[in-house]
C-alpha cells in the first residue's frame, strides 16, 4: 500500500507516457489521475514499467472501479492483466470476443493460469454456451482447452461448434468427454459423404458405440491402429473378426503388435480362435474350437 502524499509541484501527469517510469511509487500514486489512466490504458503496454509500478497503477484502477473494471478498460489492460487475481476477474463482465483475444494474447505461450481460466469461465457463462467463434479462439490459444472441461460443461457445446475442433484439440480427452462430444460430432458431420465424414469423425471415435463402428466397417474406411486403440473397449468387444478386418483394411496387420494391449487383448479373448486364424497374423488367446460361449449378461437379463 502506498501512502497518500501530495503530488510535487510540476509533476502532475497530463498523459500516460514514458516519463512516468522515472516516478517513484508514491509519486505515481499522488500524481497520476485514475480517470486519466483508465482512458489511456492502451498506452501502458508501450511503456516498460516495473512490476512495482504496475502494482500502483492497478491499485489506482481498483480504487476507481471497486465493483470491477468496465470492458473499455479491460480490453486495453495488456500486460497489466498478469497482475489481476481471479477474485478481480470474477467482478468483470466480459462480452466481447475481441477483449477475450486481447487478454489471451498476454498469456500466449504460457500454461493456462488461474486468471485465464477464470476469465474464460466468466466469458463462456456470460454467453450461455460455447459458440463456434469462442471455441475457435480458445483452442487456438490452448489446444487442450476442450479436454479441460467436464462432461457437464461439454454438454453446452452446440454441434455447430464441433467444426472448429482440430484433432490435436482432443489429444488429452478421456472417454467420458468423448462420450459427450461424439454424438455432437456425428450430428455436425452427418451430411458429409463417406470418406470426408470419416476424416472429420475419426478423432471423436473414442466415444462411438458398437453399432456405429459396425456401420463404418461397411464403408472401406481403413482406420489406422492409433485410432482403433483409442476406441471404447465395450464398443470393440462385440465386433466380429470380419468386421474388424473390414474396419482396419490394410492396417489389420498392426493388430499383432498390439495383441497384449487393450482393447485388442480383450477383443481377442472374445473371438473364436478359428476366426482369428483366418487373419493369418498369428493372434493367440481366442476361444478354443469346440467351446460353447455363454453370454451370461443376456441370461441375467432374461431371468
Amino acid at each position: 500500500e502506498v501512502e497518500k502524499t501530495a503530488c510535487p509541484s510540476g509533476k502532475k501527469a497530463r498523459e500516460i507516457d514514458e516519463s512516468l517510469i522515472f516516478y517513484k511509487k508514491w509519486e505515481l500514486e499522488a500524481c497520476v489521475d485514475a480517470a486519466l489512466l483508465a482512458t489511456q490504458m492502451d498506452r501502458v503496454n508501450a511503456i516498460p514499467f516495473t512490476y512495482e509500478q504496475l502494482d500502483v497503477l492497478k491499485h489506482k484502477l481498483d480504487e476507481l472501479y471497486p465493483q470491477g473494471y468496465p470492458e473499455s478498460v479491460i480490453q486495453h489492460l495488456g500486460y497489466l492483466f498478469l497482475k489481476m487475481s481471479p477474485e478481480d476477474i470474477r467482478k468483470w463482465n466480459v462480452t466481447s470476443l475481441e477483449t477475450l483475444k486481447a487478454l489471451l494474447e498476454v498469456n500466449k505461450g504460457h500454461e493456462m493460469s488461474p486468471q485465464v481460466a477464470t476469465l474464460i469461465d466468466r466469458f463462456v457463462k456470460g454467453r450461455g454456451q460455447l459458440d463456434k467463434d469462442t471455441l475457435d479462439t480458445l483452442t487456438a490459444f490452448y489446444p487442450g482447452y476442450l479436454c479441460s472441461l467436464s462432461p457437464e460443461e461439454l454438454s453446452s457445446v452446440p454441434p455447430s461448434s464441433i467444426w472448429a475442433v482440430r484433432p490435436q484439440d482432443l489429444d488429452t480427452c478421456d472417454p467420458r468427454q468423448l462420450d459427450v462430444l461424439y454424438p455432437k460430432a456425428r450430428l455436425a458431420f452427418q451430411n458429409m459423404n463417406g470418406s470426408e465424414y470419416f476424416v472429420k469423425i475419426q478423432s471423436f471415435l473414442g466415444g462411438a458405440p458398437t453399432e456405429d463402428l459396425k456401420a463404418l466397417s461397411q464403408q472401406n474406411v481403413s482406420m489406422d491402429l492409433a485410432t482403433f486403440m483409442k476406441l471404447r473397449t465395450d464398443a470393440v468387444l462385440p465386433l466380429t473378426v470380419a468386421e474388424v478386418q473390414k474396419l482396419l483394411g490394410p492396417h489389420v496387420e498392426g493388430l499383432k503388435a498390439e495383441e497384449r494391449h487393450r482393447p485388442v487383448r480383450d477383443w481377442i479373448l472374445r473371438q473364436r480362435q478359428d476366426d482369428l486364424d483366418t487373419l493369418g497374423l498369428g493372434l493367440q488367446g481366442g476361444i478354443p474350437n469346440g467351446y460353447l460361449v455363454l453370454d451370461l449378461s443376456m441370461q441375467e437379463a432374461l431371468s
Epitope: R43, N45, I47, P48, F49, Y79, A102, E105
Partner: nanobody, 118 residues
Framework: LQLVESGGGLDQPGGSLRLSCAAS????????IGWFRQAPGKEREGVSY????????NYADSVKGRFTISRDNAKNTVYLQMNSLKPEDTGVYSC????????????WGQGTSVTVSS
C-alpha cells in the same frame, strides 16, 4: 526469449562505463526499452528510456547530461553510455522491453552490477 545485460563493473568517480542490453530469441525493433537501477535497500528507479524507433529518448533528472541511451537494431542491442560517474550511480542496472499496443510481451533482464568508488 530474454534480455541479457553486460558491461557493468567497478569504476572510479568521474569514470565511464557502457552497458549493453542484448535480446536473445526475439527482435528488439518493435520494443521500447527502459534502463532501471536498484541500489542496495532502495526502490528500483527508472534511469533512461528509448522508443522502439529510437526517435524519442528520456532520462531521470539525476542522470541528465551524463548518461546517453542508444540502440542498434541491426545488433539487436540497446546501450547506456554512462559518463561522469558518481558514487550514487552504484547499483544493479537492468533493462526492460515493452511491446506496445497489440503486443503484450514484455521482458526483463537479470541485471549487471555497477560500483562507483574511489
Amino acid at each position: 526469449l530474454q534480455l541479457v545485460e553486460s558491461g557493468g563493473g567497478l569504476d572510479q568517480p568521474g569514470g565511464s562505463l557502457r552497458l549493453s542490453c542484448a535480446a536473445s530469441g526475439f527482435t528488439l525493433d518493435y520494443y521500447a526499452i527502459g534502463w532501471f537501477r536498484q541500489a542496495p535497500g532502495k526502490e528500483r528507479e527508472g534511469v533512461s528510456y528509448i522508443s522502439s524507433s529510437g526517435g524519442s529518448t528520456n532520462y531521470a533528472d539525476s542522470v541528465k547530461g551524463r548518461f546517453t541511451i542508444s540502440r542498434d537494431n541491426a545488433k539487436n542491442t540497446v546501450y547506456l553510455q554512462m559518463n561522469s560517474l558518481k558514487p550514487e550511480d552504484t547499483g544493479v542496472y537492468s533493462c526492460a522491453a515493452a511491446g506496445g499496443y497489440g503486443n503484450s510481451s514484455r521482458y526483463w533482464g537479470q541485471g549487471t552490477s555497477v560500483t562507483v568508488s574511489s
